[in-house]
């Protein structure tokens, strides 16, 4: 029985040209995380973190994706085209597969600074 839940950073925004950390966290299960797949909105794989085999960053993203922190992923040199959904797929043993969703909005620098100011309580 799958008892775990995926917590994600949810909807996030970042500046064009900047970087952002995509992070998911699996909780409420004792299952072992054996692999995490990071996918873009069009189902193309950005990176895989296998518990035993390590990281693989796909060639199309090698220049702009850095592994980590942890099982997360750092997207760099953001462009407007990076706006969209990102999915973390946690393959676990023995539970099976958990999936989380993050929506990233890449904003023009001035807009991002402006919206960030309004988010400060």
């Amino acid at each position: 029985m799958m008892t775990g839940t995926i917590e994600t950073t949810g909807n996030i925004s970042a500046k064009k040209g900047g970087s952002v950390i995509l992070q998911c966290h699996l909780s409420s299960t004792m299952a072992q995380v054996t692999q995490v797949n990071w996918e873009q909105h069009d189902h193309s794989l950005l990176a895989i973190r296998n518990a035993e085999l390590g990281w693989h960053i796909y060639p199309a993203f090698k220049d702009r994706v850095a592994p980590g922190p942890g099982l997360g992923l750092t997207l760099q040199s953001l462009t407007m085209n990076d706006t969209g959904e990102y999915f973390c797929t946690y393959h676990t043993y023995p539970d099976g597969t958990y999936r989380g969703r993050i929506f990233l909005e890449v904003l023009e620098s001035s807009v991002a600074e402006h919206s960030a100011r309004f988010q400060i309580p």
Partner: antibody, heavy 125, light 107 residues
């Protein structure tokens, strides 16, 4: 190029333990970044994954066989082995050892890249 | 566990014709799908990984497509050496599971 060779008895009596060994040549298990797997194929039927082990000793088993299966690795001999207890006629099959994930670092996929030629094991009294 | 279902069980095709084999997963496996070819008395060999990428040394007449739950292996022009059984397999997650196979036979 890594090659695999299965060895073990071709005939096992019901209720006994089936024991097979896979010898890896052309590469060292202790430094290899891949899974070592056992897969079987009953006569005239399809493929069934039995289980996999990593060099560190992490094991993963098919839930339908888990209570009867033990996979272990001996890095000093460059071998890994399969033990299947309490066998019945339903365990009669060709048993393959395989390497999974050998190309993960380069290509990002985990699949059974390299296979042994297989060994037929018959369970009969 | 993820159940892999292949269809048809047997496909009768004439040499030189196109063969289309299907594989369906009981839940999404993204593009984590491999195809294997097995000839009588031989071990399977990896044809396609990542749903669509040919393994080393595999001829261009073999192509894979699909994502999620629906996958296809196409052999564009069947050669005599292509008559065999073909299996799909998902990985990850554990347990690894294979489809039941499609036998491609000479019509």
């Amino acid at each position: 190029q890594v090659q695999l060779q299965e060895s073990g008895p071709g005939l096992v009596k019901p209720s006994e333990t089936l024991s097979l060994t896979c010898t890896v040549s052309g590469g060292s298990i202790s430094s290899g970044s891949y899974y070592l797997a056992w897969i079987r194929q009953p006569p005239g039927k399809g493929l069934e994954w039995i289980g996999s082990i990593f060099r560190s000793g992490s094991t993963y088993y098919n839930p339908s066989l888990e209570s009867r299966v033990t996979i272990s690795v001996d890095t000093s001999k460059n071998q890994f082995s399969l033990k299947l207890s309490s066998v019945t006629a339903a365990d009669t099959a060709v048993y393959y050892c395989a390497i999974e994930g050998a190309n993960f670092k380069d290509f990002g996929y985990v699949a059974f890249d390299i296979w042994g030629q297989g060994t037929m094991v018959t369970v009969s009294s | 566990e993820i159940v892999m279902t292949q269809s048809p069980a047997t496909l009768s095709v004439s040499p030189g014709e196109r063969a289309t084999l299907s594989c369906r997963a009981s839940q999404s496996v993204s593009s984590n799908l491999a195809w294997y070819q097995q000839k009588p008395g031989q071990a399977p060999r990896l044809l396609i990984y990542g749903a669509s990428t040919r393994a080393t040394g595999i001829p261009a007449r073999f192509s894979g497509s699909g994502s999620g739950t629906e996958f296809t292996l196409t052999i564009s022009s069947l050669q005599s050496e292509d008559f065999a059984v073909y299996y799909c397999q998902q990985s990850p997650p554990w347990p690894r599971t294979f489809g039941g196979g499609t036998k491609v036979e000479i019509k």
